[in-house]
Interface confidence: medium
């Protein structure tokens, strides 16, 4: 009678869910900027000149007080994660190949240091960062790793890196050009992720009004619907044990129903088993990462498939 | 050997102007943060500004915010104050210091120059 | 901005003794990539300030092992497990989590 029916007991329990996933669609990426690999393998001929490349995706914060550090260096494949072995590239550290500069900023190494050793890494517009490497040798066959940190306030917040192979091959089986081999169908996924999780954030942030607006029209009329209950009952209301309503203390000996407003009930409502710890429980979306916790583990691409082109 | 060597402070009337400059050496300036960070006589220290090691991002505390300017020339191994609307409190020893970089992540003034004096007086 | 609060003030210490400085913030300065920037510093008398101590706990390089930092979230503390006569001067403890970076008021340690 008073109170709610099963239906609109269940149609709030969805909507504080839908608000939920919408919130947790709305915010969740905003820190989930990933690194992606184009190519995973890179093979040449000596002599040759190659541009390696790193792709940086998903939202990027552009407040005036973040900036991005970019860097390449070589690794090994033979560790438990790939691309924590830092190696110099021609005797260039990361430090000295390092990029800086703000969110999708165009930059590049002004540096006589590196050009002397044949190198250059670039970023443009669009989040591509790259090194090229000049008139390249057998010695400059391995993996190359690039590093993106995202820095604010002098400090680091997030880090990703991305892995790819470089083969530099001599004598009569070594192609004339550069030829390059696309990352695994994996990491196409993991970039299509990452492009639908920024879309998800968008039609979140669009759609969250609209869904605010359904809930409160919902609510809106199933209180109405109460409220006529109400009037209807008031004759007989006294000594009725109800969960829709509190027993006040009685005023003068006279026992009284105090009825409960639906505002009030949907707040005792709100901590559901939905929605309960969306916003403390260290292992949801919404919380920040641990000191330890890694954004996304790196990928160790494996060429699994035939498909290469010729740059 | 790391070296920070200041230079540029002096006598300057309140409303005045001054540049200081600190010299590096020993390292690979480009590849570090730098601080300055000043000392009022007979008191504790103060952190006045910093930049890091590309250059394109500078802090500043509030009591210096829109008077102080830091900036660097990594082709000349240098770090730079200008001071403009100087005022008397900002009378002190000004050091300038090396932070550390890791991969970013700025922190730990590891070197420190010898500090230059600057004097704002009428 | 976050204040960091030294205690003691002076610090009279007989060589060979222990000594502990005491520094706590105003506000939790751990930052949000889960790190602590704690750092101590010592002004010897007619010098620069040198780093001691870094991220709470991290000696830096060429600093003897007698010295020793801990703490977290708002309170924290340098040990020196036996003083020596080169240890005077002023200790300052510094927050670089957030900014604006500052220092505590200084800890001045002599020996007795």
């Known amino acids: 009678m008073g109170v709610p029916t099963a239906l609109e007991a269940g149609s709030w329990r969805w909507g504080s869910l839908l608000f939920a996933l919408f919130l947790a669609a709305s915010l969740g990426p905003v820190a989930a900027f990933k690194v992606a690999t184009p190519y995973s393998l890179y093979v040449c001929p000596e002599g040759q000149n190659v541009t390696l490349t790193c792709r940086l995706l998903g939202p990027v914060d552009k407040g005036h007080d973040v900036t991005f550090y970019k860097t390449w260096y070589r690794s090994s494949r033979g560790e438990v994660q790939t691309c924590s072995e830092r190696r110099p590239i021609r005797n260039l550290t990361f430090q000295d190949l390092h990029l800086h500069h703000g969110g999708h900023q165009a930059a590049n190494t002004s540096h006589d240091l590196a050009q002397r050793h044949g190198l250059e890494s670039a970023s443009d517009h669009h989040g591509n960062f790259s090194i090229t490497m000049r008139n390249l040798t057998l010695l400059d066959s391995g993996l190359y790793c690039c590093l993106v940190v995202e820095i604010r306030h002098h400090h680091s917040e997030h880090r990703v890196h991305g892995a790819m192979e470089l083969q530099v091959q001599t004598g009569k089986d070594a192609p004339s050009n550069c030829v390059v081999y696309p990352s695994s169908s994996q990491d196409s996924e993991n970039i299509t992720a990452a492009a639908l999780a920024t879309g998800a954030c968008i039609v979140g942030i669009l759609c969250l009004p609209l869904i605010l607006l359904l809930v409160y029209k919902q609510r809106q009329a199933a209180s109405n619907r109460r409220a006529q209950e109400l009037v209807r009952m008031d004759s007989n209301i006294q000594g009725i044990e109800n969960p829709g309503f509190e027993a006040s203390p009685p005023a003068q000996g006279i026992p009284e129903a105090k009825v409960r407003h639906p505002l009030s009930y949907v707040a005792q409502r709100q901590p559901s088993e939905s929605g309960r710890h969306l916003l403390s429980e260290p292992s949801t979306p919404l919380s920040p990462p641990g000191p330890g916790d890694v954004f996304f583990p790196s990928l160790d691409p494996v060429p699994d498939s035939p498909n290469f082109e010729v740059i | 050997e790391v070296q920070l060597v200041e230079s540029g402070g002096g006598l300057v009337q309140p409303g005045g102007s001054l540049r200081l400059s600190c010299a590096a050496s020993?390292?690979?300036?480009?590849?570090?943060?730098m601080s300055w960070v000043r000392q009022a006589p007979g008191k504790g220290l103060e952190w006045v500004a910093s930049?890091?090691?590309?250059?394109?991002?500078?802090y500043y505390p509030d009591s210096v915010k829109g008077r102080f300017t830091i900036s660097r020339d990594n082709a000349k191994n240098s770090l730079y104050l200008q001071m403009n609307s100087l005022r008397a409190e900002d009378t002190a020893v000004y050091y300038c210091?090396?932070?550390?970089?890791?991969?970013?992540?700025?922190?730990?003034?590891?070197?420190w120059g010898q500090g230059t004096t600057v004097t704002v007086s009428s | 901005d976050i204040v960091m609060t030294q205690s003691p003030l002076s610090l009279p210490v007989t060589p060979g003794e222990p000594a502990s400085i005491s520094c706590r913030s105003s506000q939790s300065i751990v930052h949000s990539n889960g790190n602590t920037y704690l750092e101590w510093y010592l002004q010897k008398p007619g010098q620069s300030p040198q780093l001691l101590i870094y991220k709470v706990s991290n000696r830096f390089s060429g600093v003897p092992d007698r010295f020793s930092g801990s703490g977290s979230g708002t309170d924290f503390t340098l040990k020196i497990s036996r003083v020596e006569a080169e240890d005077v001067g002023v200790y300052y403890c510094f927050q670089g989590s957030h900014v604006p970076w500052t220092f505590g008021q200084g800890t001045k340690l002599e020996i007795k």
């Open positions: 020993g390292f690979t300036f480009r590849n570090y943060g």
């Open positions: 930049i890091i090691s590309g250059g394109s991002y500078t």
């Open positions: 210091a090396r932070i550390y970089d890791h991969d970013g992540d700025y922190y730990a003034m590891d070197y």
